[in-house]
């Protein structure tokens, strides 16, 4: 059983589907296009019901090179047969096609986070959306990496329930007057390379009084 998508050249575009702030974002790059499109239209169908290609409303005649498909693509098992059309004015420059399976092709971008340094601990505030759909949880685990003087420590906080709302983790037992850097990422049980956040660094203040923090671990 297969759905033979129309004869589009899939080689002229590179697609990537990412979970960004727990939203499914499809982005694309063009290969070897002498004329840069002024706008794009994204269409798709699903392999199990190969009906006419459906235009994604918020990605019709768009100038952006990405499209939020969270409300369109819900199943991790379906094959989403995707077509991207590139235009210059009213002229169609190209069409590219690609099939996506969210469970296989999704990559996971790191969540937003802030750090606040104290004498001997760092508060890491990780920002998750207030509501995350069940099918976008993907069995992910949060990893917080602490780096100092060439030593990297991995923290894997246990998050009760879904990754939603803001989450604070305390990295404790730190040395005052020392520079620490923190990176945050989502780990999946798979081969997709982990996408780590850029490091955020803080120099802890020198220790005056003895201060201890209750660990959230």
């Amino acid at each position: 059983i297969s759905y033979d998508s129309p004869d589009y050249t899939d080689e002229s575009c590179t697609f990537k589907i990412s979970l960004r702030n727990f939203r499914s974002i499809l982005s694309w790059e063009l290969k070897n296009h002498s004329i840069v499109p002024t706008h794009y239209t994204l269409l798709y169908t699903i392999m199990s019901k190969p009906e006419d290609l459906k235009v994604v409303k918020n990605c019709a005649n768009t100038t952006r090179s990405f499209c939020d498909l969270t409300d369109e693509w819900r199943s991790t098992h379906e094959a989403y047969v995707t077509v991207l059309e590139g235009f210059s004015g009213n002229t169609t420059l190209f069409s590219c096609s690609h099939n996506f399976w969210l469970a296989i092709d999704m990559s996971f971008e790191p969540p937003e986070f802030e750090i606040v340094g104290f004498t001997n601990h760092i508060n890491v505030m990780v920002k998750f959306p207030s509501i995350v759909e069940e099918e976008l949880q993907f069995d992910l685990s949060l990893v917080i990496e602490e780096q100092s003087e060439g030593i990297v420590k991995k923290h894997k906080p246990e998050i009760k329930g879904n990754m939603s709302g803001n989450f604070t983790y305390i990295i404790d037992k730190l040395i005052p007057n020392t520079n620490y850097c923190v990176s945050v990422y989502l780990e999946h049980s798979d081969e997709q390379a982990v996408i780590k956040s850029p490091l955020k660094c803080t120099l802890l203040p020198p220790g005056q009084e003895s201060e201890s923090a209750e660990s959230a671990k």
Partner: antibody, heavy 119, light 112 residues
């Protein structure tokens, strides 16, 4: 019609590697996932992993990570599974299978490739 | 991992008689998309597996309608209304809902 033609039987030494191929025909190779399954002698079936030939993205059974490496060559419509650091435990028949409409549903299977690891 | 338990291990039948195989999973196979990815295949002696049923009850093309699949959640059944000689072999259920996919231990359908 859909066909998955696998490479022939292999007799290999412990510690070496082997690469099993699975050539697809009768459909557009990049439009369907390819899964791999192990069957040890007289045993049941065990899932190894799945690859999207269009993107090269792979998902493995944790048990086979570091043992199996799945790849695909779009130009020849062929999927490959490399097995490394072979031991007698890896002696088995290996099947490739194509997913149909849905991930995990394996609608067409190759004829199997027997791999025997022996010194 | 999801454990798939098939019973019986061996089923001895007479041609023309019905047969029933049970498959139970250690957790629900209902996916968040509303589908249940439970499939059945037959492996005849010395042959590669052939899928018979997918999504619990959908018959593959070319599979005779004497085969029926049913069930939901964690309990599933494959029934053959009247066994024919070509039906002999080992039947496996497998789930494709939760990674890693897992197979039942198999049920050998043989002649009495």
């Amino acid at each position: 019609q859909v066909q998955l033609q696998q490479s022939g039987a292999e007799l290999v030494r412990p510690g070496t590697s082997v690469k099993v191929s699975c050539k697809a025909s009768g459909y557009a190779f990049i439009n369907n996932l390819i899964e791999w399954v192990q069957q040890r002698p007289g045993q049941g079936l065990e899932w190894i992993g799945v690859i999207n030939p269009g993107s090269g993205n792979v998902k493995y059974n944790e048990k086979f990570k570091g043992k199996a490496t799945l790849t695909a060559d779009k130009s020849s419509s062929t999927a490959y599974m490399q097995l490394s650091s072979l031991t007698s435990d890896d002696s088995a028949v290996y099947f490739c299978a194509r997913d149909g409409y849905y991930l995990g549903t394996m609608d067409h299977w190759g004829q199997g490739t027997s791999v025997t690891v022996s010194s | 991992d999801v454990v798939m338990t098939q019973t019986p291990l061996t089923l001895s039948v007479t041609i023309g008689q019905p047969a029933s195989i049970s498959c139970k999973s250690s957790q629900s196979l209902l996916d968040s998309d509303g589908k249940t990815y439970l499939n059945w295949l037959l492996q005849r002696p010395g042959q590669s597996p052939k899928r018979l049923i997918y999504l619990v009850s959908k018959l593959d093309s070319g599979v005779p309608d004497r085969f029926t699949g049913s069930g939901s959640g964690t309990d599933f059944t494959l029934k053959i209304s009247r066994v024919e000689a070509e039906d002999l072999g080992i039947y496996y259920c497998w789930q494709g809902t939760h990674f890693p996919w897992t197979f039942g231990g198999g049920t050998k359908l043989e002649l009495k």
